[in-house]
Interface confidence: low
């Protein structure tokens, strides 16, 4: 009696079972009752990932350097290329298939957390006590100057963009 | 607000079949992929089926393939398991739950299963 | 299939304490655009189950500031900074990085 399934790493063709082809080879031809499944490699530019009956191997990811990606990792015959994106930016979703720009913290905002190829900047607003006047990936919020510690009063208060003044004790005349 | 509701369940022999629905509300059914997850008494979960948004894709638990089937009705906002030859290991609570996502820059990014039904009872008896 | 393994089963905590759960993947989860691929689920006696966690530390909305995941590839945790009564339950961590999707046997946080 002809199968109804097969075994794991097999497929059912012409109520027989055939073995299926490795990782990193395609399908020429099933097997028959006298000869057995005929695979060859994939080619340099492809891959296959599973053991399979594909009759085409699957072409590796493209990076494409105009819209931000590199090679992460080269694909192999059984593994597809891995792109991740340039210094300064970072992907656009899960499958990375484009890359973005890393957000600047604007002036009162400070960053939270640096980007990464995966992730964008993550920034915060600077609390009392602390200031950011530039447009930054990479800054945090600063705390204002301490003017007593310089031995001076503050003239102007600071802001979430602004340090405070500092400036000369008023002497008081005899 | 958003919600599943689960019905179809009760007591069934061994070898019979049952049909459980799941009824979506509150939110647009036909953009989210969809799982049946099920708990035996006193046990943990465990993973039944899961249906793309359009209901191309489908993929079963070894445990239930060739006797279960996941289909969903966009049209009706509606989610069902057919479930054939019933065994008495079958007998737990099915929940309807959906695959979360939220779209960002014009892409999807998995948020979790972030909606779970009631749960609806399957009891298999002699 | 990818297995989860979490420790404690069974974990009794004083309100106002820290509780940690384990959950140990058979494989890495970790997936090449740098997202972990691990939630966590609670479910609290007699309801259905919610998520907590999702893609290994983001927290689902709604879900307190306590609660707070972390890890990557196949070591994660989930901490509770400060238990509370209505915490009490069933935590479990599940894989969605590949499918059939599979859940940690699930650790029983009860009141000390």
């Known amino acids: 009696e002809p199968p109804t399934a097969c075994r794991e790493k097999q497929y059912l063709i012409n109520s027989q079972c055939c073995s299926l082809c490795q990782p990193g080879q395609k399908l020429v031809s099933d097997c028959t009752e006298f000869t057995e499944t005929e695979c060859l490699p994939c080619s340099e530019s492809e891959f296959l990932d599973t053991w399979n009956r594909e009759t085409r191997c699957h072409q590796h990811k493209y990076c494409d350097p105009n819209l931000g990606l590199r090679v992460q990792q080269k694909g192999t015959s059984e593994t597809d290329t891995i792109c991740t994106c340039e210094e300064g930016l970072h992907c656009m979703s899960e499958s990375c298939e484009s890359c973005v720009p890393h957000r600047s913290c604007l002036p009162g905002f400070g960053v939270k957390q640096i980007a990464t190829g995966v992730s964008d900047t993550i920034c915060e607003p600077c609390p009392v006590g602390f200031f950011s006047n530039v447009s930054s990936a990479f800054e945090k919020c600063r705390p204002w100057t301490s003017c007593e510690t310089k031995d001076l009063v503050v003239q102007q208060a600071g802001t979430n963009k602004t340090d405070v003044v500092c400036g000369p004790q008023d002497r008081q005349r005899a | 607000q958003v919600q599943l509701v689960e019905s179809g369940g009760g007591v069934v022999q061994p070898g019979r079949s049952l049909r459980l629905s799941c009824a979506a509300s509150?939110?647009?059914?036909?953009?989210?992929?969809m799982h049946w997850v099920r708990q035996a008494p006193g046990k943990g979960l465990e993973w039944v089926a899961v249906?793309?948004?359009?209901?191309?894709?489908?993929y079963h638990a070894d445990s239930v393939k060739g006797r279960f089937t996941i289909s969903r009705d966009n049209s009706k906002n509606a989610l069902y398991l057919q479930m054939n030859s019933l065994r008495v290991e079958d007998t737990a609570v099915y929940y309807c739950?959906?695959?979360?996502?939220?779209?960002?820059?014009?892409?999807?990014?998995?948020?979790?299963?972030?909606?779970w039904g009631q749960g609806t009872t399957v009891t298999v008896s002699s | 299939d990818i297995v989860l393994t979490q420790s404690p089963l069974s974990l009794p905590v004083t309100p106002g304490e820290p509780a940690s759960i384990s959950c140990r993947s058979s494989?890495?989860?970790?997936?090449?655009?740098?997202?972990?691929?691990l939630d966590w689920y609670l479910q609290k006696p007699g309801q259905s189950p919610q998520l907590l966690i999702y893609?290994?530390?983001n927290r689902a909305s709604g879900v307190p500031d306590r609660f707070s995941g972390s890890g990557s590839g196949t070591d994660f945790t989930l901490k509770i900074s400060r238990l509370e009564a209505e915490d009490v339950g069933v935590y479990y961590c599940?894989?969605?990085?590949?499918?059939?999707?599979?859940f940690g046997q699930g650790t029983k946080v009860e009141i000390k």
């Open positions: 509150g939110f647009t059914f036909s953009s989210y992929g």
């Open positions: 494989q890495s989860l970790l997936y090449s655009n740098g997202y972990n691929f």
């Open positions: 249906i793309s948004k359009d209901g191309g894709n489908k």
């Open positions: 599940m894989q969605a990085l590949q499918t059939p999707r599979t």
């Open positions: 893609l290994g530390s």
């Open positions: 739950v959906r695959r979360g996502h939220q779209l960002v820059l014009g892409y999807y990014y998995y948020n979790g299963l972030d909606v």
